[in-house]
């Protein structure tokens, strides 16, 4: 079985951990894709997850939570936005293939929230006070709400993950700029 | 354009082998399931099974799992329906059909079907 | 396996009505049914998935409604290319059965 192996992002409450999981084009471009939660001792849990089919540059928001999928980069883009420290867990994004067990998409994430340094409330130009300004997806996704560990497997890409703040702008003219490794084939 | 072929119409007598065809065409063959069922004259719809041409991963319905053998052969972009033994009850219109992109149990493209006639 | 039961077996309305059909399933499948269409001498085609979302290329008058073991087919305004078997399908349990369909006839 493949290692499971994970990358650490030390976040402060109220910033956006902004991930960018990499899959092949051709075969997952439409393929639902979810955003889980593994806590010890637990099946992995789904926080969210895109349309069935998925749709291209189709922001799904769940909560602090917001998903797009860009079918011509091959990358599934996550949001979680205004952090808490509750947030602190281990994450994985994967996709939904039935009915094939789904494919995990990148080494899974360790997220650690802590607090942000003392003062105004608002003052840190990472914190999230403002209504975030994606608008949230009407359509209502059916996702999956397990998936068995033992049968999720690995795929070699990491993902691109990076910190910041609520205004910052879609941009995804650098997409080349990632690190473009196939995921399956 | 996306499309399955199936074989021609077969007539043949209990007890004797067969093998059906579908090919795929338009389409990246390995990366979508392949299913098949079945449809009695005047009858209803049976789901018998499907496969993954990419890793010959096959599913079977208990009612005909050992009864029949689904295969494909992906360097010709084709899936196989078999049967070893013949019987009358057999005599059936078979489709075969392709899973979706991102959802190999649902069906988008359906072949034009092969009749298969058992009569001694 | 799961039991797929369809009613009306038979459906006799004119063109411009509303059909209603409606498909049980013998133990909850979420939302994971599919509804498909088959003409005379034709294969079957895709028109519901995930109880209520149309496939592509369906047109508007087809809808599908209902969750757990309770599903229904509706066409709000029969044309005349509507007149068919319906069948239901679920495929959230192995195998993915389907129901008995029902036949929708011109009366």
């Known amino acids: 079985a493949t290692k499971l192996t994970e990358e650490k992002y030390e976040l402060k409450e109220g910033q956006t951990l902004d991930v960018k999981c990499d899959y092949t084009l051709e075969k997952f471009a439409s393929s639902q894709k979810a955003w889980q939660i593994i806590r010890d001792g637990e099946m992995p849990k789904t926080l969210a997850c895109t349309e069935r089919p998925s749709k291209n540059s189709h922001p799904v928001q769940v909560g602090r939570i917001i998903l797009e999928d860009y079918h011509d980069h091959g990358l599934l883009r996550v949001r979680m936005v205004n952090l808490q420290v509750e947030d602190s867990g281990l994450y994985q994004c994967v996709i939904y293939q039935p009915p094939k067990e789904p494919h995990m998409l990148f080494d899974r994430i360790r997220l650690v929230v802590t607090k942000g340094f003392s003062g105004t409330p608002g003052s840190n130009e990472n914190s999230t006070q403002n209504v975030y300004k994606i608008p949230p997806t009407t359509t209502k996704a059916l996702c999956p709400l397990y998936t068995s560990p033992r049968t999720v497997t690995q795929a070699p890409p990491k993902s691109t993950a990076d910190v910041s703040t609520p205004d910052s702008e879609i941009n995804l003219t650098n997409v080349t700029d990632i690190i473009r490794v196939p995921v399956f084939n | 354009e996306v499309q399955l072929v199936q074989s021609g119409a077969e007539v043949k007598k209990p007890g004797e082998s067969l093998k059906i065809s579908c090919k795929g065409s338009?389409?990246?063959?390995?990366?979508?399931?392949i299913g098949w069922v079945r449809q009695m004259p005047g009858k209803g719809l049976e789901w018998m099974g499907i496969i993954y041409p990419g890793d010959s991963d096959t599913r079977y319905s208990p009612s005909f799992q050992g009864q029949v053998t689904i295969s494909a052969d992906k360097s010709i972009s084709t899936a196989y329906l078999q049967w070893s033994s013949l019987k009358a009850s057999d005599t059936a219109m078979y489709y075969c059909?392709?899973?979706?992109?991102?959802?190999?149990?649902?069906?988008?493209?359906w072949g034009q079907g092969t009749m298969v006639t058992v009569s001694s | 396996e799961i039991v797929l039961t369809q009613s009306p077996a038979t459906l006799s309305l004119s063109p411009g009505e509303r059909a209603t059909l409606s498909c049980r399933a013998s133990q909850s499948v979420s939302s994971y049914l599919a509804w498909y269409q088959q003409k005379p001498g034709q294969a079957p085609r895709l028109l519901i998935y995930d109880a209520s979302n149309r496939a592509t290329g369906i047109p508007a008058r087809f809808s599908g409604s209902g969750s757990g073991t309770d599903f229904t087919l509706t066409i709000s305004s029969l044309e005349p290319e509507d007149f068919a078997v319906y069948y239901c399908?679920?495929?959230?349990?192995?195998?993915?059965?389907f129901g008995g369909g029902t036949k929708v006839e011109i009366k």
């Open positions: 338009g389409y990246s063959f390995t990366t979508y399931w």
């Open positions: 059909a392709r899973g979706s992109p991102w959802d190999g149990r649902l069906f988008d493209i």
């Open positions: 399908q679920q495929f959230d349990n192995l195998p993915y059965t």
